[in-house]
């Protein structure tokens, strides 16, 4: 049985236009930047800036290019062989356990802790206890515990499927 393609992996089939380049599959597969035709006899190029495929494949359509959300910046554009690369804007980060959204970095550490790591697009500020040097768990502290202002509300979810 074939593997599922999940929503985050998928993208739309673009019906082959006459001007799209065609070539023959090699051992039943089409090269990156192409998808296979309905009859399996041709490889049809993906449309630059619209869709892509990254591997040799027998998918019947190319994958949809991601569009960076507001709250994200585009690091590199979508090509026929590579999806768009988006990154959270300065002052926000994307957590591993909630990759669908950019969250605002905390503006300060809780009382009794010091900042040892800056906000990056992939991590919040890092805080450690002054005395012990152990890291803060990362939970958002209660308002009254914070040295400065409380964290802002999360940015809108990042759409990974375009």
């Amino acid at each position: 049985e074939s593997a599922l393609i999940t929503q985050q992996d998928l993208a739309p089939q673009q019906r082959a236009a006459p001007q799209q380049k065609r070539s023959s599959p090699s051992e039943g597969l089409c090269p990156p930047g192409h998808h296979i035709s309905e009859d399996g006899r041709d490889c049809i190029s993906c449309k630059y800036g619209q869709d892509y495929s990254t591997h040799w494949n027998d998918l019947l359509f190319c994958l949809r290019c991601t569009r960076c959300d507001s709250g994200e910046v585009e690091l590199s554009p979508c090509t026929t062989t590579r999806n768009t690369v988006c990154q959270c804007e300065e002052g926000t980060f994307r957590e591993e356990d909630s990759p669908e959204m950019c969250r605002k970095c905390r503006t300060g550490c809780p009382r009794g802790m010091v900042k040892v790591g800056d906000c990056t697009p992939w991590s919040d500020i890092e805080c450690v206890h002054k005395e012990s040097g152990t890291k803060h768990s990362g939970e958002v502290p209660a308002v009254e515990e914070t040295v400065t202002s409380s964290p802002g509300t999360p940015a809108s979810p990042c759409s990974l499927s375009g």
């Epitope: 074939s2 998928l10 993208a11 089939q13 599959p25 039943g28 309905e38 019947l60 359509f61």
Partner: antibody, heavy 122, light 112 residues
Framework: EVQLVQSGAEVKKPGASVKVSCKAS????????MNWMKQSPGMSLEWIGR????????FYNQKFKGKATLTVDKSTSTAYMELSSLRSEDTAVYFC???????????????WGQGTLVTVSS | DIVMTQSPLSLPVTPGEPASISCRSS???????????LHWYLQKPGQSPQLLIY???NRFSGVPDRFSGSGSGTDFTLKISRVEAEDVGVYYC?????????FGPGTKVEIK
């Protein structure tokens, strides 16, 4: 558990239209094509066409172009097939069935709906 | 369109005995990628079809190993090594090498 549950039997007059639904559950709806088949009384199966829920692309058997229109509602994981200008020869059981997005494994149907009987009679 | 034919169209069987169904296509089902897209389904009475065998000889998950498929080119066979009462129904072969995909007329298997 993968399930495809179709709408109930319909009786229609010649010239009318009918819309059959197929609600999917137990898998990622946008991860598979949804196909439709026709089984006329005492007859074999005919492949009508398929719908790509991911990008809303359709691919029809030439014989059913203009007769069947395939759509989906992704919010409810439901596929639809509308048959127009009904005639007595459209009387059949219609099945939905899923297939994979890959050419090599996309031509067979691993799960089927229970079927919907459409009767066209004046 | 590819025409699929099956024989016999009706097959009375005895439980415990073997059974064999033949399927022929009007053109070779060997694709240019060297794979053969011939599949078998069983439609039990009052039910929808269920996939038994895909690509000539691959048993779908949950299908008992008494079912086997073989063949090449235009000639294919579905064998049941020992028929059981639950195997009754109509067996269809189907091809997806050529668009549009087509089905055979079906072989009705019933207990003698």
């Amino acid at each position: 558990e993968v399930q495809l549950v179709q709408s109930g039997a319909e009786v229609k007059k010649p010239g009318a239209s009918v819309k059959v639904s197929c609600k999917a559950s137990g898998y990622s709806f946008i991860g598979y094509f949804m196909n439709w088949m026709k089984q006329s009384p005492g007859m074999s199966l005919e492949w009508i066409g398929r719908f790509n829920p991911y990008n809303e692309d359709t691919f029809y058997n030439q014989k059913f172009k203009g007769k069947a229109t395939l759509t989906v509602d992704k919010s409810t994981s439901t596929a639809y097939m509308e048959l127009s200008s009904l005639r007595s020869e459209d009387t059949a059981v219609y099945f939905c069935a899923r297939s994979a997005y890959y050419f090599d494994s996309g031509g067979y149907f691993d799960y089927w709906g229970q079927g919907t009987l459409v009767t066209v009679s004046s | 369109d590819i025409v699929m034919t099956q024989s016999p169209l009706s097959l009375p069987v005895t439980p415990g005995e073997p059974a064999s169904i033949s399927c022929r296509s009007s053109q070779s089902l060997v694709h240019s990628n060297f794979n053969t897209y011939l599949h078998w389904y069983l439609q039990k009475p009052g039910q929808s079809p269920q996939l038994l065998i895909y690509k000539v000889s691959n048993r779908f998950s949950g299908v008992p190993d008494r079912f086997s498929g073989s063949g090449s080119g235009t000639d294919f066979t579905l064998k049941i090594s020992r028929v059981e009462a639950e195997d009754v129904g109509v067996y269809y072969c189907s091809q997806s090498t050529h668009v549009p995909w087509t089905f055979g007329p079906g072989t009705k298997v019933e207990i003698k």
